[in-house]
Structure formats: C-alpha cells, structure tokens
C-alpha cells in the first residue's frame, strides 16, 4: 500500500491545495489528502488520535476499492469479514465465522459442515470403500497344508475418507474360519502359502466357514493323525456350521 500524504503549496479555497505530494490530487495541511490521483484509492489512516487522508494503490485488509467517476475510495468490508471483493462478497471471514458463498456465517447451513482449517462451509463427505479383494488362502500358523482348521482374510481400501460429519467407514478387514486343504505338507512347504483352494462362494454379505470340496477331500491322501470315520466327519461338519464366525476391523 503506497501511501502519500499531502502538503499544501498553492492555495485554492480555504484549506485546499492542488500542489500536493505523491498520490494526492488535492490536499490540506490538517487533513492530508482530500482526493487522489487517478487509479489511487482514498483511505483514512489513523495516526494517534487523528485520522488523515492517504492515497493508496491498493486497499488494506478489511477494505475493498470502490470506483466512481474520478473518485475512488477504500470501503470497509462487513463487520464479520476480513477480506472482501465488494460489500456483498467476502473472501475471508473474521475468526469465529465460516465462509459460504461470499457470506460469513455463525453456523454452516444444513447439509454442509464447518472446516476449521479453512474456516469455510464445505460439503459433507461420506466414506467410500472399494469392492472386497479376493479371500486370502486358508492358513493355519502360516501353513496352507495339512487337514487343520485355519483362517482366511479379505480386505478392501478406503477410497474416500469421511469429513467430520460424514458417515464412518465400514470394516475394511474381514476374517473367517476355514479348513486347510487336506494334503500332506512337503518338506520345504512349512509356513509357505499355497494357492487359494477352490470353494463355494458364500452369499454376498455372509461370512461362512469354508468346507473343502468333496473332490479335494477324496483326492488327498490321508495320514494317520488326520484319519476320522465318516460319522465323526459328519458330526464335526454340523458343529462347525453352528460356530461360523466373522471377525472385522473397523476404520
């Protein structure tokens, strides 16, 4: 803001001179600038208890430039506004107010929320998540072999994090019980994850325990500790179905 204060030289009518310094067009000893040269804005500058006229190339914070034929002035923004484009369009609000469509509000309107960083009213953003990724292989202590009960997991990503008033994200991790493929672990296979076995897909939204296909059960060679009679197998299947569990992690 380039300010110029006037000093009277050539007297016009009482207290008015045109022989002024800097940006003043007319000035007086007592009041400083009375009017400004083209494109400059008149403003009152407080010096102690006194206000004197100055001519500025741009208006200070809290003011905007008004232009009328041959007379420009810095005009105050509204009381709740820090910087403005004109009287009716604020671009930055004072502390405690939120900017919305050029206005400063105590509270944001319905459907919007206050962003305390930008001090603006913004749209409420709800959480968005991706589709579930496929289930991981069924493992027990990192092993994908041996006829034992294990777990499998699937995950999905957060595409859009919610804003303060937005809907929270649903679980992004899901774990369920499953049965490890009935096959003998090879020597170097301990802890090594195998390919995901074939299984029936659970219904959408369900998280059922996986039961091996009859084909895969038949084709796998039994080893002594895994041997069970048909009656025991049947009984176990029923119990496991009742115990089906889904573990979720909420974000």
């Amino acid at each position: 803001q380039n300010a110029s204060r006037g000093r009277r030289q050539r007297r016009m009518h009482p207290n008015v001179s045109q022989g002024c310094q800097g940006g003043c067009a007319t000035c007086s000893d007592y009041n400083g600038c009375l009017s400004c040269k083209p494109r400059l804005f008149f403003a009152l500058e407080r010096i102690g208890m006194k206000q004197i006229g100055v001519c500025l190339s741009s208006c200070p914070s809290g003011y905007y430039g008004t232009r009328y034929p041959d007379i420009n002035k810095c005009t105050k923004c509204k009381a709740d506004c820090d910087t403005c484009f004109n009287k009716n369009f604020c671009t930055k609000c004072k502390s405690g107010f939120y900017l919305h469509l050029g206005k400063c509000l105590d509270n944001c309107p319905e459907g919007l929320e206050a962003n305390n960083h930008t001090m603006e009213c913004v749209s409420i953003v709800h959480c968005e998540v991706s589709e579930w990724n496929p289930w991981s292989p069924c493992t027990k202590k990192g092993k994908t072999c041996g006829f034992k009960r294990g777990t499998e997991t699937r995950v999905r990503e957060i595409i859009q994090h919610p804003s303060a008033k937005g809907n929270l994200c649903p679980p992004t991790n899901e774990t369920r019980k499953c049965t490890v493929q009935r096959k003998k672990c090879q020597k170097g296979e301990r802890g090594k994850k195998g390919r995901e076995r074939k299984r029936k897909k659970p219904n959408k939204g369900e998280s059922k325990e996986a039961i091996p296909d009859s084909k895969s059960l038949e084709s796998s060679k039994e080893i002594p500790e895994q041997r069970e009679n048909k009656q025991q197998q049947k009984k176990r299947k029923v119990q496991d179905k009742q115990k089906s569990v889904s573990v979720s992690t909420v974000h």
């Epitope: 016009m12 008015v16 400083g32 600038c33 041959d70 007379i71």
Partner: antibody
Framework: EVQLQESGPSLVKPSQTLSLTCSVT????????WSWIRKFPGNKLEFMGY???????YYIPSLKSRVSITRDTSKNQYYLQLNSVTTEDTATYYC?????????????WGQGTLVTVSS | DIKMTQSPSSMYASLGERVTITCKAS??????LSWFQQKPGKSPKTLIY???RLIDGVPSRFSGSGSGQDYSLTINSLEYEDMGIYYC?????????FGAGTRLEIK
Amino acid sequence: EVQLQESGPSLVKPSQTLSLTCSVTGDSITSGYWSWIRKFPGNKLEFMGYISFSGKTYYIPSLKSRVSITRDTSKNQYYLQLNSVTTEDTATYYCATYHGYGGPWFAYWGQGTLVTVSS
Amino acid sequence: DIKMTQSPSSMYASLGERVTITCKASQDIDSYLSWFQQKPGKSPKTLIYLTNRLIDGVPSRFSGSGSGQDYSLTINSLEYEDMGIYYCLQYDEFPVTFGAGTRLEIK
C-alpha cells in the same frame, strides 16, 4: 470565497424538461466535484449526482434515465437537465461542491432555486 | 442505498441546554458522516465532517462523535441562533444519503 448561484425557470409544466444553471466563482470547476441536490416540500434532501473535474458524471440510480449534468468550463458553469418532470419533482434545487473524501462534503452551497412543476 | 435514520424528528429545548441529535446508518459508514444546519430560507451549512471535524468558523459548542453505524451531534449549551433543521449525511457509499432531518426549536 467560493460562491455558487443557481438560475433557471421557477415553473415547469409536467412532461417537460427542467433546466438549471450553476455559476461558480472563487474556484474552478476543473477541480473537485460539482453536485446537484434537491429539497422536497417535506424537507427531505436528495443528492442527484455530480460532474467531476474531468467532466465525468455520476447519477443516482433512481434518476439515471432522465437526468443529465453537463458543464462549460469557459464559463465556469455546470448544468442540470431533468426530463419528463412530474409534480413529484417540485423542490428547491441546490448546487453544491466538495473536494474529496478527506474534506468537508458540500462545504459550499448555492442559495437554492424553487422549481414548481405544475400545468 | 444506505438509509440514515435520524432522531428525534423534532424537539424543543431551552437556552443553555445540552442537546443531542442522533443518526443511525443501515450499515457501517466508517466515519464518513457530516452534519448540516439549515435555517428557514437559507441553504444548508456544513458544521461537521468526518464524524467529528468542525468546520472553521463553527462555534465550539458543536461537536460530533460516533463510529460504525451510530453517530451523534451535540450542542453543548444551546443558543437562540441554533434553531433550525439539522441533517446528517453519509458519504461512505454512493449514492450519498441524508437523514430526514431534526427540527430544533427553542422552548
């Protein structure tokens, strides 16, 4: 001492044009802002517009379509024309001047001229 | 347009009395306010500009104050010659606008 003096007809017929002159002495109309103000019978004052030192004009929105302020720098005079007058335009018309925001507004006034709009 | 609400619209006061006339703007006018006195058959005379600056030759019993939207003119000790109509004027924004006036009469 700056002096302003209004002149023109005191009676104008409805739908006609009101024309007034303001003659300025003690200052040049090529400096400052030269205005017309009117005072209605109920004592209400209304600023009508101005002509600037460069000859640019400003008119209040309610009169913009029918008002005109012009000047003759060689005579140091400026003029008011108000078209399509009605009885509502009956008022005392003043010319007045100011030199900018930092000084007194309308520090100098003419004595005023009463214009009656009547058939 | 900025509306200037002036009060009272008329008043009677005794000589030597302290008189206050107020003007309220419809929005903040940032001290761009003048006061005028008009006597019957005369043109208005500027008393005060920029809220509190007295025009040369105006008696010191006249004073102005205010900020934001609220402004006042005070006559400290009323004299007979002070009777007339008083107007406020805002010139913060065009069109500049006057108050409706306060008629001051002596009791």
